[in-house]
């Protein structure tokens, strides 16, 4: 038993042109989280096979809001390690899938929205108890940097976590043939139950007397490294009968082939034979098929009938990217006309129209006056989505149905008396005042503050407001 630990160091734009847009915006702040899936062995497994070694989900990272105009930086990450416990022996070789997820925190209908930003996969050899291994993987324009290790949980020890430790029986030393259990120096290895001589580093057993080899090793005691190079190579055959021991450094040393590819030496360099689903000089390119469902958000996968043919994704509205993994801010295109409010619901775009406008994009100006009559000779005026009546003199209200009392507002100044008249109002001014609203005092010398009175009207006469 033990734990696989994954430490994410950074997730951000990779080198080169075509830097991705930040996945978060001021309108849609978001945070990242990660998922890791582990499968044993380098053998090609069906893509839909479960995470047989285990899976783990990280905590959510800090909320991030894009700075307008700034390129996407490395995004803030969740704290802590992703830990995947394993119950049985550590297989020594494993496949991993690491997914970077975005949780959008904007006004989402039905809570936060999740979308997959990037998915990387690889196959690696790793001994338990070893140091942290560092790795960089790219997914489209994104780059993920991380470290990983496998460690045994006491009492298990060894590169496969199959050897057991037990407390010392004597205070000074372990029994014959048994070593102290590093790092638990106060404990000793339990007696081995494997076949005598079975390599403690490269072999393990689950039944007494057996010796099963970790991938990459062979022989009855798992002491012979498997080499894919021919034993009749120029450097000569090995004396071993169960495998090929290559004495000098060769181009296949350290196996440059990724994702479980096998290396063969060529006169000038090496050649990788890639497992199904991978290709490229070092098997570094994943040949995903449409049946694997590589298009996110319901995208249509075209081509990619077999691993050697590329696929393309035809994205649903509102998504883009080579795998439809990026949400388009469709409202940034301002599709709603006439001041309508844009709502991107993910599966649809909606415009909430201002009064007086309609249509999917608020493109229709409603005829506010259609079927609306203004009474008593009023005329209908369209505007701002609400019909309005311009009423004839003496009438008011929304539809000009109310008889207006022009004197209600006490329009005559200085104690003038107001009389309603069919065409408006008339002010009868108090002595000493004149004007349509009795607003001007008559001067003592007989001159008025107004210009000469119009013909036919004497100062002080009731002034009719025309």
């Amino acid at each position: 038993a033990g734990v696989f630990e994954l430490q994410i160091h950074s997730f951000g734009p990779g080198p080169g042109p075509g830097a991705p847009r930040s996945p978060c915006s001021a309108r849609l702040p978001c945070r990242l989280f990660f998922r890791v899936c582990l499968k044993p062995g380098l053998s090609e497994e069906a893509a839909e096979s479960p995470c047989a070694l285990g899976a783990a989900l990280s905590a959510r990272g800090p909320v991030y809001t894009e700075q307008p105009g700034a390129p996407a930086p490395d995004l803030p990450l969740p704290d802590g390690l992703l830990q995947v416990p394993f119950r049985d022996a550590w297989p020594g070789t494993f496949s991993f899938i690491i997914e970077t997820w975005r949780e959008e925190l904007g006004d989402q209908i039905g809570g936060p929205a999740w979308s997959l930003l990037a998915r990387v996969a690889g196959r690696r050899r790793l001994a338990a108890g070893g140091p942290w291994a560092r790795d960089i993987q790219r997914a489209g324009a994104w780059e993920l940097r991380f470290s990983y290790r496998a460690r045994c949980e006491p009492p298990a020890v060894g590169t496969a976590c199959t050897r057991l430790c037990r407390p010392r029986s004597a205070p000074s030393r372990c029994g014959p043939g048994l070593r102290p259990c590093a790092p638990l120096e106060d404990e000793c290895e339990a007696p081995l139950v494997c076949r005598a001589g079975c390599s403690p580093e490269h072999g393990f057993c689950e039944q007494p007397g057996e010796c099963r080899c970790l991938e990459g090793w062979t022989g009855p005691l798992c002491t012979v490294p498997v080499s894919t190079s021919s034993c009749l190579s120029p450097r000569g055959p090995s004396s071993a009968t169960t495998g090929c021991l290559v004495p000098g450094p060769g181009p296949c040393d350290g196996n440059p082939c990724a994702n479980g590819g096998s290396c063969s030496e060529t006169p000038r360099s090496f050649e990788c034979t890639c497992p199904r689903g991978f290709y490229g000089l070092r098997c570094e390119v994943s040949g995903v098929t449409c049946a694997d469902g590589p298009c996110f958000n319901g995208g249509l996968c075209v081509g990619g009938a077999d691993p050697d043919s590329a696929y393309i994704c035809h994205c649903p509205p509102g998504f883009q990217g080579s795998n439809c993994e990026k949400r388009v801010d469709r409202c940034s295109l301002q599709p709603c006309r006439n001041g309508g409010l844009c709502l991107d619901l993910g599966h649809a775009l909606r415009c909430r129209c201002r009064a007086g406008f309609a249509g999917p994009r608020c493109e229709h100006d409603l005829d506010d006056c259609a079927g609306r009559a203004c009474a008593n000779g009023g005329t209908c005026v369209e505007g701002g989505g609400a019909h309005r009546c311009s009423c004839a003199l003496g009438f008011g209200g929304r539809d000009c149905r109310e008889r207006a009392d022009p004197c209600a507002a006490r329009p005559c100044a200085h104690g003038g008396r107001c009389y309603a008249h069919f065409s408006g109002l008339v002010c009868a001014c108090a002595p000493g005042y004149m004007g349509a609203r009795c607003e001007f005092p008559v001067h003592p010398d007989g001159a008025s503050a107004l210009p000469a009175a119009p013909p036919g009207l004497r100062p002080g006469d009731p002034q009719r407001y025309l």
């Epitope: 999740w114 049946a291 694997d292 469902g293 298009c295 319901g298 249509l300 996968c301 509205p317 619901l345």
Partner: antibody, heavy 117, light 107 residues
């Protein structure tokens, strides 16, 4: 080869219930949105509903005509999507197909549901 | 919901004929239109996506065109296996909606 196989159709009385299943093979099922689309006798195609992925909290969407009566669920471990139909009406009589994705790229062969008294 | 109106509802043609089916959307759907073929007793098959792109394995005699509200499916030279019902569907706005279908029969 991609295969979607529907089952569970049959004759049911109005107001009754039925549960359809769609078993997928040849695809990484857990990566696909799944839909149900129906076709009434001699009529066109009508989208019924959709279920999305685990990473999307298995979000579901339904046509107005079935909202509140039909429920879609999925079991990724069994590569199967289900359509639970309650309070069935005569107008629900149709061949029901399961399809994948947003654009309905893969289709099953269909299962017939007849609602009649 | 967006309405898709297909015409004609049926047509008779001979092998080798050029056949054109039209579909009209009740509002702008961009190029988010697909065409499906359905043979009697079988499930529909995707032919064209994105208004004009042939899906994997679809013969080149099938072509699609149009954008906005008016779309066309053309079969350049009708083959015996093409006698079927054809449906257009819009995927611009959720929910997806289909036309009423066009039945292509042997003359």
């Amino acid at each position: 080869e991609v295969q979607l196989v529907e089952s569970g159709g049959g004759l049911v009385k109005p107001g009754g219930s039925l549960r359809l299943s769609c078993a997928a093979s040849g695809i990484t099922f857990s990566n696909f949105w799944m839909n149900w689309v129906r076709q009434a006798p001699g009529k066109g195609l009508e989208w019924v509903g959709q279920i999305r992925l685990k990473s999307e909290d298995y979000a579901t969407h339904y046509a107005e005509s079935v909202k509140g009566r039909f429920t879609i669920s999925r079991e990724d471990s069994k590569n199967t999507v289900y359509l639970q139909m309650n309070s069935l009406k005569t107008e629900d009589t149709a061949v029901y197909y399961c399809t994948t994705g947003y654009y309905f790229d893969y289709w099953g062969q269909g299962t017939t549901v007849t609602v009649s008294s | 919901n967006i309405q898709m109106t297909q015409s004609p509802s049926s047509l008779s043609a001979s092998v080798g004929d050029r056949v054109t089916i039209t579909c009209k959307a009740s509002e702008n759907v961009g190029t988010y239109v697909s065409w499906y073929q359905q043979k009697p007793g079988k499930s529909p098959k995707l032919l064209i996506y994105g208004a004009s792109n042939r899906y994997t394995g679809v013969p080149s005699r099938f072509s699609g065109s149009g954008s906005g509200t008016d779309f066309t499916l053309t079969i350049s030279s009708l083959q015996p296996e093409d006698f079927a019902t054809y449906y257009c569907g819009q995927f611009y706005s959720f929910p997806s909606t289909f036309g009423g279908g066009t039945k292509v029969e042997i003359k």
